[in-house]
Interface confidence: low
């Protein structure tokens, strides 16, 4: 297996965020509420929407786009250049598939290090790990082709936007209310 090496070409340079929590990857937590929140994406230097589960998570979570921008985005020029890897695959390509601890049923793709191919799996909707792609193409571009564009160097640069899809086993017995 090729070892993952640090990136050598980042333009513009990554600046140190005003607050350290701005560099945290988005974390919707293990709970299953449906709360619209915003996080700062260190890869794009933009505030983006995500669905928060209602508990755990981290401080990179804001009630409004404005608050997110005020805390994290104001010191960054808009970043248009993608991060590139010198060689090898991002280290998260070697993580096992992980559906997380929630109970949605979302089709996602992961890189199977045994078969050396991207394969489909069912994702629960929260947590899990970064070996989790919305499309087969994105998975192939990131993990099958020896790198290319994508994130996941260290935790500080890892950020993913999680799409929440409600659902669960047929016997699931709760009355759902999208509160907050």
């Amino acid at each position: 297996d090729e070892e993952f090496t640090n990136i050598t070409d980042i333009k513009p340079p990554l600046q140190k965020p005003t607050h350290s929590f701005c560099a945290m990857k988005v974390d919707d937590g293990p709970c299953r509420a449906y709360i619209k929140r915003f996080f700062f994406n260190i890869l794009t230097h933009q505030c983006e929407e995500f669905i928060y589960g209602g508990c755990e998570g981290n401080e990179n979570r804001f009630e409004s786009l404005e608050e997110c921008k005020e805390k994290c985005a104001r010191d960054y020029p808009k970043m248009t250049t993608k991060l590139t890897f010198q060689k090898g695959k991002p280290d998260f390509c070697f993580l096992e598939e992980d559906p997380g601890i929630c109970r949605g049923y979302i089709t996602r793709y992961f890189y199977n290090n045994q078969s050396k191919q991207c394969e489909r799996f069912k994702y629960g909707g929260c947590l899990g790990n970064l070996n989790n792609f919305e499309s087969l193409e994105e998975c192939k571009n990131t993990c099958e082709n020896g790198g290319g564009s994508g994130g996941g160097l260290n935790d500080i640069f890892e950020a993913q936007k999680i799409e929440w899809h409600e659902g669960g086993p047929p016997h699931h017995h709760h009355h759902h209310h999208h509160h907050h």
């Epitope: 293990p30 755990e56 559906p99 997380g100 601890i101």
Partner: antibody
Framework: EVQLVESGGGLVQPGGSLRLSCAAS????????MSWVRQAPGKGLEWVSA????????YYADSVKGRFTISRDNSKNTLYLQMNSLRAEDTAVYYC???????????WGQGTLVTVSS | QSVLTQPPSLSGAPGQRVTISCTGS?????????VQWYQQLPGTAPKLLIF???NRPSGVPDRFSGSRSGTSASLAITGLQAEDEANYYC????????????FGGGTKLTVLG
């Protein structure tokens, strides 16, 4: 019908070990995170540990970190709690429960009593 | 000492309305974390009563309702019945305790008469 049945409790000396099991039925076990919650005699509830549906993510209360290990065997629909270096304050009824909406535990087992005493 | 504070005991007559309070802090309820409520009848396992602040699982009577505001939450029981005599626990998440699910100390509800 959802059923969770704990076993493995008993009397153990301080410093000893015990392994609890929780047999699950009536739901797709691998689709659910599971937790252990304990209750000392005459006291309140205390969360101990949780594990993701796949077993890939584990969480522990500070009071048991480094001593207890949660695991699961999805092929056997069974949850485990390996308890090492047991202390008198670990004496409690241990419940397994499945994680559901909003961090709630929506189904609970009947509990198994662990007594740590010399 | 529990992270969430509940009154140790409460009592009410059949048919009355009782409210059990649960007081937290800025690191749990005040940080927008949901609260759950459990009922534990004598000698039995806890049962989920309210999840996500104010949602009832199916099978829980609508006599039970929950709310949360700021650093406090409450469980209201209307039309109190003898079978409601039990211990009630609130539960949430506390971000200051390295990712710990936390409970209140429990409230023993006695139905009089």
């Amino acid at each position: 019908e959802v059923q969770l049945v704990e076993s493995g409790g008993g009397l153990v000396q301080p410093g000893g070990s015990l392994r609890l099991s929780c047999a699950a039925s009536g739901f797709t076990f691998s689709s659910y995170a599971m937790s252990w919650v304990r209750q000392a005699p005459g006291k309140g509830l205390e969360w101990v540990s949780a594990i993701s549906g796949s077993g890939g993510s584990t969480y522990y209360a500070d009071s048991v970190k480094g001593r207890f290990t949660i695991s699961r065997d999805n092929s056997k629909n069974t949850l485990y709690l390996q308890m090492n270096s047991l202390r008198a304050e670990d004496t409690a009824v241990y419940y397994c429960a499945n994680n559901g909406a909003a961090a709630a535990w929506d189904y609970w087992g009947q509990g198994t009593l662990v007594t740590v005493s010399s | 000492q529990s992270v969430l504070t509940q009154p140790p005991s409460l009592s009410g007559a059949p048919g009355q309305r009782v409210t059990i309070s649960c007081t937290g802090s800025s690191s749990n309820l005040g940080a927008d974390y949901d609260v759950q409520w459990y009922q534990q009848l004598p000698g039995t396992a806890p049962k989920l009563l309210i999840f996500g602040n104010n949602n009832r699982p199916s099978g829980v009577p609508d006599r039970f309702s929950g709310s949360r505001s700021g650093t406090s939450a409450s469980l209201a029981i209307t039309g109190l019945q003898a079978e409601d005599e039990a211990n009630y626990y609130c539960q949430s998440y506390d971000r200051s305790l390295s990712g710990s699910m936390v409970f209140g100390g429990g409230t023993k509800l006695t139905v009089l008469g």
